[in-house]
């Protein structure tokens, strides 16, 4: 099983501060649930890195939901989570900045931003809500930070994890920083499994970031998010390498699953998403 052979590089706490999520559910989308109540609740928005208000319907939903702003902050934010270090080194744009706008195959049309290589600026476009490509940003600022040239022709680069909004995901961007800081897994590996909107029951796999394994789920045939793979191998190949867990005594480690008897106590309360 290829899962057994995957290992993470051990990384210490002395590096540039990554975006730190206290709990994996802090990366979930705000989910109002199927009910119709109007209840003011708070969720952690991974794009703004802040706790924000949303309207909860009163049932179901997910764990990224808090009664108060204070509770949300306590569970999902850290003092240095907003620290972004900007460089003035000449950097290349990530390759995806040169991709054409891609609405994807779904029909939940929303406004997103992409970098238009013809006009050399970020522009809004009509996104269908699923798939597409990584030249897709929730805000104009994200798009500009990643794909537009900064002052004096310099590319603005962020060492803190860049937040890309394709399917509400953390998207570390490809930048020329030392390989020590590389995060090899795609952003959507942190998102929960999403059945989507249709009625099919297709066998798919998603990466469960809490347990660090690929798990099966039933896909409806449309919608959903990109944490959706046709085989376990594909899922592992895409997600397994990049996920880093923090052990309780400090330091970052990924256990070797092959050695079934070896037990490593994982403290799931803190998930570090390292920047590329």
């Amino acid at each position: 099983d290829s899962e057994e052979d995957e290992e993470h590089t051990i990384i210490t706490d002395t590096e540039l501060p990554p975006l730190k999520l206290m709990h994996s559910f802090c990366a979930f989308k705000a989910d109002d649930g199927p009910c119709k109540a109007i209840m003011k609740r708070f969720f952690f928005n991974i794009f703004t890195r802040q706790c924000e208000e949303f309207i909860y319907g009163g049932c179901e939903g997910n764990q990224n939901r808090f009664e108060s702003l204070e509770e949300c902050k306590k569970m999902c934010t850290r003092d240095n989570a907003n620290r972004i270090i900007k460089t003035t080194l000449q950097q290349e744009k990530p390759d995806f900045c040169f991709l054409e706008e891609d609405p994807g195959i779904c029909r939940g049309y929303i406004t997103r931003y992409f970098y238009n290589n013809q006009t050399k600026q970020c522009e809004r476009f009509k996104y269908g809500g699923c798939l597409g490509n990584m030249n897709n940003f929730e805000t104009l600022e994200e798009c500009k930070n990643i794909c537009e040239d900064g002052p004096n022709g310099f590319q603005v680069d962020n060492y803190g994890t860049q937040l890309n909004a394709v399917n509400n995901s953390l998207t570390p961007q490809s930048t020329k920083v030392p390989s020590l800081f590389e995060f090899h897994g795609p952003s959507w590996c942190l998102t929960p499994a999403d059945r989507g909107l249709c009625r099919a029951n297709e066998n798919r796999f998603y990466y469960n970031s809490v347990i660090g394994k690929c798990r099966p789920f039933k896909y409806s045939g449309c919608g959903g998010n990109e944490n959706n793979f046709t085989s376990k191998q594909e899922c592992l190949r895409a997600c397994k390498k990049g996920f880093i867990q923090r052990i309780s005594k400090g330091g970052l480690i990924k256990t070797k699953r092959k050695r079934k008897k070896q037990r490593v106590k994982i403290a799931y309360e803190e998930i570090f998403v390292k920047n590329m």
Partner: antibody, heavy 119, light 108 residues
Framework: EVQLVQSGAELKKPGASVKLSCKAS????????MHWVRQAPGQGLEWIGE????????NYNEKFKTRATLTADKSTSTAYMELSSLRSEDTAVYYC????????????WGQGTTVTVSS | EIVLTQSPATLSLSPGERATLSCSAS???????LYWYQQKPGQAPRLWIS???ILASGVPARFSGSGSGTKYTLTISSLEPEDFAVYFC?????????FGQGTKLEIK
């Protein structure tokens, strides 16, 4: 000075088509979206669609997708909207309006073209 | 599509009074994507407020906008004669872009 000048009023029979024009001046025509919005007598505003002339990017309101056709002539800085299979409910004032590429702040509007559909 | 419902349909007030116009969305709309337009009889609409609360050029400071999620408000602190018009809210978060049916602010 930015100006959007629309073509004159139209009287059409049900089932016919109408093609409206909107001539832009005072700005770089290809660098902005051109929207088409209509307003039936005494009613609210209804967005029909938008076109970005440089790359011919077009987004339609699904309601109008089968009947509306948006085009643009870069050489004359003119946007067009053709509406086919007209019915009485299409009687309205049709506006063109421009917005930037990053939002839909329609900061300049044409004067409007009245289209009357009547047998 | 996101349906924007404005209330009241007509608001009759006198100059000097405070006006509160509401716009309710059928689904949550980010505040950045909620705009207001003013329209006077025989004229095209005019951009009035963008991003929920940012006044367009030339709009007097007596106007203000607020709200989040599904509830948005346009407030005029003290009505002037030139404020009487129809106001439309507009969202561009989701396609198709939509407008409310308008609130007509008339002189009492």
């Amino acid at each position: 000075e930015v100006q959007l000048v629309q073509s004159g009023a139209e009287l059409k029979k049900p089932g016919a088509s109408v093609k409206l024009s909107c001539k832009a001046s005072g700005y770089t025509f290809t660098s902005y979206w051109m929207h088409w919005v209509r307003q039936a007598p005494g009613q609210g505003l209804e967005w029909i669609g938008e076109i970005k002339p440089d790359q011919g990017r077009i987004n339609y309101n699904e309601k109008f997708k089968t009947r509306a056709t948006l085009t643009a002539d870069k050489s004359t800085s003119t946007a067009y909207m053709e509406l086919s299979s007209l019915r009485s409910e299409d009687t309205a004032v049709y506006y063109c309006a421009r917005s930037s590429v990053v939002d839909t702040a329609m900061d300049y509007w044409g004067q409007g073209t009245t289209v009357t559909v009547s047998s | 599509e996101i349906v924007l419902t404005q209330s009241p349909a007509t608001l009759s007030l006198s100059p000097g009074e405070r006006a509160t116009l509401s716009c309710s969305a059928s689904s949550s709309v980010s505040s950045s994507y909620l705009y207001w337009y003013q329209q006077k009889p025989g004229q095209a609409p005019r951009l009035w407020i963008s991003g929920t609360s940012i006044l367009a050029s030339g709009v007097p400071a007596r106007f203000s906008g607020s709200g989040s999620g599904t509830k948005y408000t346009l407030t005029i602190s003290s009505l002037e004669p030139e404020d009487f018009a129809v106001y439309f809210c507009h969202q561009w978060s989701h396609y198709p872009f939509t407008f409310g049916q308008g609130t007509k602010l008339e002189i009492k």
